[in-house]
Amino acid sequence: VPRWRQQWSGPGTTKRFPETVLARCVKYTEIHPEMRHVDCQSVWDAFKGAFISKHPCNITEEDYQPLMKLGTQTVPCNKILLWSRIKDLAHQFTQVQRDMFTLEDTLLGYLADDLTWCGEFNTSKINYQSCPDWRKDCSNNPVSVFWKTVSRRFAEAACDVVHVMLNGSRSKIFDKNSTFGSVEVHNLQPEKVQTLEAWVIHGGREDSRDLCQDPTIKELESIISKRNIQFSCKNIYRPDKFLQCVKNPEDSSCTSEI
């Protein structure tokens, strides 16, 4: 008789999830010499241990602590780029500006990027059919808790000037409910972080508005200022030119506003 299985509202675990995590770990440790000591099998065991046999609506940050310990990585704290709702451009930027890091440029972020996973209470099975949706089912699900945990740690590690890339095409350029707005902003350490510099990325070719004056940016400024961190904001009117100028900063057209 087939066992009853909980039906969740979100997509199930990404197919070949164990193989993908292990392969990504091996690839990352090969590319990053400072992480060559990492035992990828142990990393997978710790990852699996965080959610297997546990109710997928009852996951805690403590569940991920063994994985956090194995994935400990020192990133230059003054080279951190946060992002919200504009992941692709942020990743394109750090691929060019190699000394800067998004969360997904770290081992743990790289392992889990774009993946979904969950298990089932009291069985060692991975659920490939469905996983809890953050809104419709529960917030303490394996994926959400993972990103909350690594995002908090990433923000806590930051120092000096921290940059955040924000999507100027969205109705809420700064969204208090995003990972950046709900986790990272509140875990920047005022004694370490001097300034948060927001880069607002414009979508339209002819968009010359100063999006740094947007009400949601003013809200971000207020939150940051109350935490005694300085705030700065820049419009990136031409993201294509912005990336080009990161690649070729000596280009004569790169002195003008981008």
């Epitope: 400990t72 990585q73 020192t74 990133v75 230059p76 704290c77 003054n78 740690r153 806590e156 590690a157 120092c159 000096d160 000037v161 350490q189 004694e191 370490k192 001097q194 300034t195 510099e197 200022s225 005694n228 300085q230 705030f231 700065s232």
Partner: antibody
């Protein structure tokens, strides 16, 4: 290039007040907080605190609370240190130094002498 | 407050030799692998000059003869080889936890 230029030496009598200025150039003033550091004659360095140049919020170290006030005039990219009710033991060189918590940029220092 | 203790208080070194100054913090100054300990050189009548930030990063324009190492509570500034114009006071400073604090200084003299 980044520069912090402080006001000149001051000779004051006990009980008087003094205001030391620190004018910044070569960067966006409101992007980096300004620290104040004291060095008494022949002594080491003491961090007095800092001022958030974006909000104007001062953070004063416990040993300097009361008579020491940090202020700003962002229109001229200048930070100020005011000391009231001066005492002989306030005699020192006062430095401004730009954040972050490691100080790559310092003013040249302002000697404040308190003597009757 | 985090107390920083430098040793030795003074040091006399011949040109071409190695000078080593240590700084011990009363508690860890590390945060996620980054150490918030910095080193300065100060010559008479001048403001301090940043040499090393975050334990081991050489400030731009500072000769590679200067190097820093250490983590958590124990840190070292090394000058190798020492030159005649390295005569100065050297200070460590932490920015892990307010109030920022400095070591009491080490006076380096060239024989």
């Amino acid at each position: 290039q980044i520069q912090l230029v402080q006001s000149g030496s001051e000779l004051k009598k006990p009980g008087a007040s003094v205001k030391v200025s620190c004018k910044a150039s070569g960067y966006t003033f409101t992007n980096y907080g300004m620290n104040w550091v004291r060095q008494a004659p022949g002594q080491g360095l003491e961090w007095m605190g800092w001022i958030n140049t974006y909000t104007g919020e001062p953070t004063v170290a416990d040993d300097f609370k009361g008579r020491f006030v940090f202020s700003l005039d962002t229109s001229v990219s200048t930070a100020y240190l005011q000391i009231s009710s001066l005492k002989a033991e306030d005699t020192a060189v006062y430095y401004c130094a730009r954040n972050p918590g490691w100080f790559a940029y310092w003013g040249q220092g302002t000697l404040v002498t308190v003597s009757s | 407050d985090i107390v920083l203790t430098q040793s030795p208080a003074s040091l006399a070194v011949s040109p071409g030799q190695r000078a080593t100054i240590t700084c011990r913090a009363s508690e860890s100054v590390d945060n996620y692998g980054n150490s918030f300990m910095h080193w300065y050189q100060q010559k008479p009548g001048q403001p301090p000059k940043l040499l090393i930030y975050r334990a081991s990063n050489l400030e731009s324009g500072v000769p590679a003869r200067f190097s820093g190492s250490g983590s958590r509570t124990d840190f070292t500034l090394t000058i190798n080889p020492v030159e005649a114009n390295d005569t100065a006071n050297y200070y460590c400073q932490q920015s892990h936890e307010a109030p920022w604090t400095f070591g009491q200084g080490t006076k380096v003299e060239i024989k």
